[in-house]
């Protein structure tokens, strides 16, 4: 019969023959022949291969370097890579999470719209009319101005996006 030019899924072509690929978690040590199966070997500790493959070397698990603010979120197996995330207060600089930066703080006049996670930075928003933030913070939202009326007081100083209103007593002369 004619030698194959293409092989089935989970097979590869070598020496005019279709050989089985190695399953995830194993690497290739010997190709198949007319008389023998493909020979595969499990990946070692701290190594992985996540696809059906014909690799002769397994990949090293990613190292979550604490000096870069990284820690292990999910330990790697022979079939999966280690997943890193950032220490509390830090977030990844890229999708691959190779290093971390400190969460951004929202300046006065801005509040936290979305608190940062290990993979995303703080999202700030300007405080709208009626709200303020007088601190630089990675957690604080914009606070509503104090309602002087509910305290039976009057506004003595208008609020801004950075300051609360100042309430004072009612003017007694006005009867």
């Amino acid at each position: 019969p004619e030698p194959p030019t293409a092989c089935r899924e989970k097979q590869y072509l070598i020496n005019s023959q279709c050989c089985s690929l190695c399953q995830p978690g194993q690497k290739l040590v010997s190709d198949c022949t007319e008389f023998t199966e493909t020979e595969c070997l499990p990946c070692g500790e701290s190594e992985f291969l996540d696809t059906w493959n014909r690799e002769t070397h397994c990949h090293q698990h990613k190292y979550c370097d604490p000096n870069l603010g990284l820690r292990v979120q999910q330990k790697g197996t022979s079939e999966t890579d280690t997943i890193c995330t950032c220490e509390e207060g830090w977030h990844c600089t890229s999708e691959a999470c190779e290093s971390c930066v400190l969460h951004r703080s929202c300046s006065p006049g801005f509040g936290v719209k979305q608190i940062a996670t290990g993979v995303s930075d703080t999202i700030c928003e300007p405080c709208p009319v009626g709200f303020f933030s007088n601190v630089s913070s990675a957690f604080e939202k914009c606070h509503p101005w104090t309602s002087c009326e509910t305290k039976d007081l009057v506004v003595q100083q208008a609020g801004t996006n950075k300051t609360d209103v100042v309430c004072g007593p009612q003017d007694r002369l006005r009867a």
């Epitope: 040590v29 010997s30 023998t36 199966e37």
Partner: antibody, heavy 119, light 106 residues
């Protein structure tokens, strides 16, 4: 028939190295990886590692990294293992083995090489 | 590493007696293989892929198990069965062996 012929017994001094061999015959040598297994006096079997006879890539048990070095000479159908900086702990029988034509198990073993480390 | 714990370490059985050797893995494996070794000889493949007898192995031998628990059974002990039996996993690197069970004839 498939044969794995190992080199003879070695009596060596502590601190030196020894290189033992395993010659494959009765099959195409590059079709199968060669594995090395240590059997100490306690009769315990320990997998040292394996070497691809075709690609030359070696895989080691972490425990034997720096102790064992596996190589292959395709032209003579022979696999070698060198053991470095020998101590009494390395005194053991060392076997080479290969799997069968199908499946992941050691179907064929060499006769073993006894390495004795003694001053 | 996947640790394989065999029990018992040593046992003796009379001819005709049923013998069971167990092998417990520290984490789950797909299959277990068994080797027989007699003094002064290399290990011999005895049972592969948990329950398949290697060529020339008498049918009184059988293997079973799954996950972390495996066993080798001899339905009726014979003198020639006296040997050391080792379980072995090829599932995770480093490949590992049990410490062996020495089976003696009573």
């Amino acid at each position: 028939q498939v044969q794995l012929q190992q080199s003879g017994a070695e009596l060596v001094r502590p601190g030196v190295s020894v290189k033992i061999s395993c010659k494959g015959s009765g099959y195409t040598f590059t079709d199968h990886a060669i594995h090395w297994v240590k059997q100490s006096h306690a009769r315990r079997l320990e997998w040292i590692g394996a070497i691809s006879t075709n690609y030359g890539a070696a895989t080691y048990n972490q425990k034997f990294k720096g102790k064992a070095t596996m190589t292959v000479d395709k032209s003579s159908s022979t696999a070698y293992m060198e053991l470095a900086r020998l101590t009494s702990e390395d005194s053991a029988i060392y076997y080479c083995a290969r799997r069968g034509s199908h499946g992941d198990w050691f179907a064929y073993w060499g006769q073993g090489t006894l390495v004795t480390v003694s001053a | 590493d996947i640790e394989l714990t065999q029990s018992p370490a040593i046992m003796s059985a009379s001819p005709g007696e049923k013998v069971t050797i167990t092998c417990s893995a520290s984490s789950s494996v797909s299959y277990m293989h068994w080797f027989q070794q007699k003094p002064g000889t290399s290990p011999k493949l005895w049972i592969y892929s948990t329950s398949n007898l290697a060529s020339g192995v008498p049918v009184r031998f059988s293997g079973s198990g799954s996950g972390t628990s495996y066993s080798l059974t001899i339905s009726s002990m014979e003198a020639e069965d006296a040997a050391t039996y080792y379980c072995h996993q090829y599932h995770r690197s480093p490949l590992t062996f049990g410490a062996g069970t020495k089976l003696e004839l009573k």
